[in-house]
Interface confidence: low
């Protein structure tokens, strides 16, 4: 419906604490390098203005939409042409250009300093001191970091981050209470990040077509009793709510957000059996909630899908009649009986169940043609399968850190010319798909594994496409969204790449490491792996587990040294002539 | 229905080692961080180890630090204490605790086990 003023009907909506809280996010997900006193200035004076129109919605100026509004606001920041560059040359633009140009500049991998945390009694200091500043720079410093963060979800997290600091300030033992909520925060908010990343790939590289049919899989595995007519109105709705945020439209993500947990709660009878719970918390925790409550329990006795995929007459009439209909049919039907499948493998056979009803039902004997298209589904799916099999195996064999490292070793291999700290940051989170995965059941295994692998995939497509430098990553990452994984696996040893050349100092190491947290030595491990593959990527796997192992000992011998930095230059120097020998460098 | 079932706890002289252990059931364990608290005798609760889903990190009291080890097996459903030169004003009963993700109340956990340090 439309309103005089979009800013006081969103102001009236959401209230003034979550209206100010998500045009921070939306400001700092936009101009990431901008000091918060700056974003807090001018969130205020949007607040002001935003009062203004609530009172009188034909105030100057308050029928503008949003996008003038806050892109007018962004555009009166002094130091923009310094601090961003060509990103300035938007604030040229008109709307809705002017917006899209914001949207093409964010950046995945902005080079901010990494976020250290203080000590508890620091933190609990400046929390007691100044909440309401606290918590909005918790906000900022997430939402700059990740663009694309889910905006009504960081509120969430952000509520969440408070309640630990005003329970556990007043603790006895205060880091007891607040570490591993911290940890838990921090662990979950990249998670958060990294799902919403792929929403947001996939709208915007892909087209809203792809994303509704990832939620049609979804949503059916989720909710298999509700009717497809259900599942589709939830489409809808959810692809209006992930467009309006991965378009930096939060205000109206968040109020529509709001409008479908309400509308699910209050039809959950013929939607789910297991959103009872959810339904009875406050809005953030029942959004939260709903996102991630478990499959309901599949109706009993559910008929074949042949009959009506396969046997039926009238399939190539009901595939021409409505083809997006009949083929979200069709993917309704197969995802409600597969919670088991990923949500990738679902939406592959219903690409395969597509292609072939385009060939068939031009043919001159259309059911003869399609009569053995499930056929051709089996080795889809036991391609995942055997592959989730062998991983799961050597994860156990080898435990998380040395699983990391021979995909580490793998991709590497694949995709030599992605820099180091992509290939480690991407391999490692790969690696964590063992842990997370390999000890559910088979019947979770795969969407457990093959869907976060997607989610991974796509940090490596959305980093490499800032800085592209290998046509098969661009290859794998824009040819399909779901054959993204399976073109990955599919790379071989990459034949064409010149080995880099050797660089002492990449293997120069100093006593510092020896203070580092057991991850971040990890990773400099890690990182001297991938260097190591770089410059010898024929070396086999029992030469370069011979040189890391030495590395190792290197490292521990030397952080025992009484003299540990005389230890690293002198032990340093012999590792890296024997590890030359070693590899033939 | 979520079950949190402690053990291993009994009497034990100062400087002596137990290690008690908690089988829980009911809940996905491998994605809950999980705790130890113990009461003293006529004394309030007070929190002695913290372990993330993951197992790590951990976090200790300072009461406990460089004595008590917590760790878990997500494949046996199961927390463990491993309690090294144990003093007198460690007896309590000890319980394990499902860590809860936002407000700190205790929705779920076990009955204790009694650990009683004397000589």
């Known amino acids: 419906d439309a309103h005089k003023s979009e800013v006081a009907h969103r102001f009236k909506d959401l209230g003034e604490e979550n209206f100010k809280a998500l045009v921070l996010i939306a400001f700092a997900q936009y101009l990431q390098q901008c000091p918060f006193e700056d974003h807090v200035k001018l969130v205020n004076e949007v607040t002001e203005f935003a009062k203004t129109c609530v009172a009188d919605e034909s105030a100057e100026n308050c029928d503008k939409s949003l996008h003038t509004l806050f892109g007018d606001k962004l555009c009166t920041v002094a130091t923009l042409r310094e601090t961003y560059g060509e990103m300035a040359d938007c604030c040229a633009k008109q709307e809705p250009e002017r917006n899209e140009c914001f949207l093409q500049h964010k950046d995945d991998n902005p080079n901010l300093p990494r976020l250290v945390r203080p000590e508890v009694d620091v933190m609990c200091t400046a929390f007691h001191d100044n909440e309401e500043t606290f918590l909005k720079k918790y906000l900022y410093e997430i939402a700059r970091r990740h663009p694309y963060f889910y905006a009504p979800e960081l509120l969430f997290f952000a509520k969440r981050y408070k309640a630990a600091f005003t329970e556990c300030c007043q603790a006895a033992d205060k880091a007891a209470c607040l570490l591993p909520k911290l940890d838990e925060l921090r662990d979950e908010g990249k998670a958060s990040s990294a799902k919403q990343r792929l929403k947001c790939a996939s709208l915007q590289k892909f087209g809203e077509r792809a994303f509704k049919a990832w939620a049609v899989a979804r949503l059916s595995q989720r909710f298999p009793k509700a009717e497809f007519a259900e599942v589709s109105k939830l489409v809808t709705d959810l692809t209006k709510v992930h467009t309006e945020c991965c378009h930096g439209d939060l205000l109206e993500c968040a109020d529509d957000r709001a409008d479908l947990a309400k509308y699910i709660c209050e039809n959950q009878d013929s939607i789910s059996s297991k959103l009872k719970e959810c339904c009875e918390k406050p809005l953030l925790e029942k959004s939260h909630c709903i996102a991630e409550v478990e499959n309901d329990e599949m109706p009993a006795d559910l008929p074949s899908l042949a009959a009506d995929f396969v046997e039926s007459k009238d399939v190539c009439k009901n595939y021409a009649e409505a083809k997006d209909v009949f083929l979200g049919m069709f993917l309704y039907e197969y995802a409600r009986r597969h919670p088991d499948y990923s949500v990738v493998l679902l939406l592959r056979l219903a690409k395969t169940y597509e292609t072939t009803l385009e060939k068939c039902c031009a043919a001159a004997d259309p059911h003869e043609c399609y009569a053995k298209v499930f056929d051709e589904f089996k080795p889809l799916v036991e391609e995942p399968q055997n592959l989730i099999k062998q991983n799961c195996e050597l994860f156990e064999q080898l435990g998380e850190y040395k699983f990391q490292n021979a995909l580490l070793v793998r991709y590497t291999k694949k995709v030599p010319q992605v820099s180091t700290p992509t290939l480690v940051e991407v391999s490692r989170n790969l690696g964590k798909v063992g842990s997370k995965c390999c000890k559910h059941p088979e019947a979770k295994r795969m969407p457990c594994a093959e869907d976060y692998l997607s989610v991974v995939l796509n940090q490596l497509c959305v980093l490499h496409e800032k800085t592209p430098v290998s046509d098969r990553v661009t290859k794998c990452c824009t040819e399909s969204l779901v054959n993204r994984r399976p073109c990955f696996s599919a790379l071989e040893v990459d034949e064409t790449y010149v080995p880099k050349e050797f660089n002492a100092e990449t293997f120069t190491f100093h006593a510092d490491i020896c203070t580092l947290s057991e991850k971040e030595r990890q990773i400099k491990k890690q990182t001297a792996l991938v260097e190591l593959v770089k410059h010898k990527p024929k070396a086999t796997k029992e030469q370069l587990k011979a040189v890391m192992d030495d590395f190792a000992a290197f490292v521990e011998k030397c952080c025992k040294a009484d003299d540990k930095e005389t230890c690293f230059a002198e032990e340093g120097k012999k590792l890296v002539a024997a590890s030359q020998a070693a590899l033939g460098l | 229905e979520v079950q949190l079932l402690e053990s291993g706890g009994g009497l034990v002289q100062p400087g002596g080692s137990l290690r008690l252990s908690c089988a829980a059931s009911g809940f996905t364990f491998d994605t809950s961080s999980m705790l130890w608290v113990r009461q003293a005798p006529g004394k309030g609760l007070e929190w002695v180890s913290v372990i993330h889903q993951s197992g790590t990190p951990t976090y200790y009291a300072d009461s406990v630090k460089g004595r008590f080890t917590i760790s878990r097996d997500n494949s046996k459903n199961t927390l463990y204490l491993q309690m090294n030169s144990l003093r007198a004003e460690d007896t309590a009963l000890y319980y394990c605790?499902?860590?809860?993700?936002?407000?700190?109340?205790?929705?779920?956990w076990g009955q204790g086990t009694l650990v009683k340090v004397s000589s």
């Open positions: 605790a499902k860590f809860p993700s936002s407000r700190m109340k205790f929705d779920y």
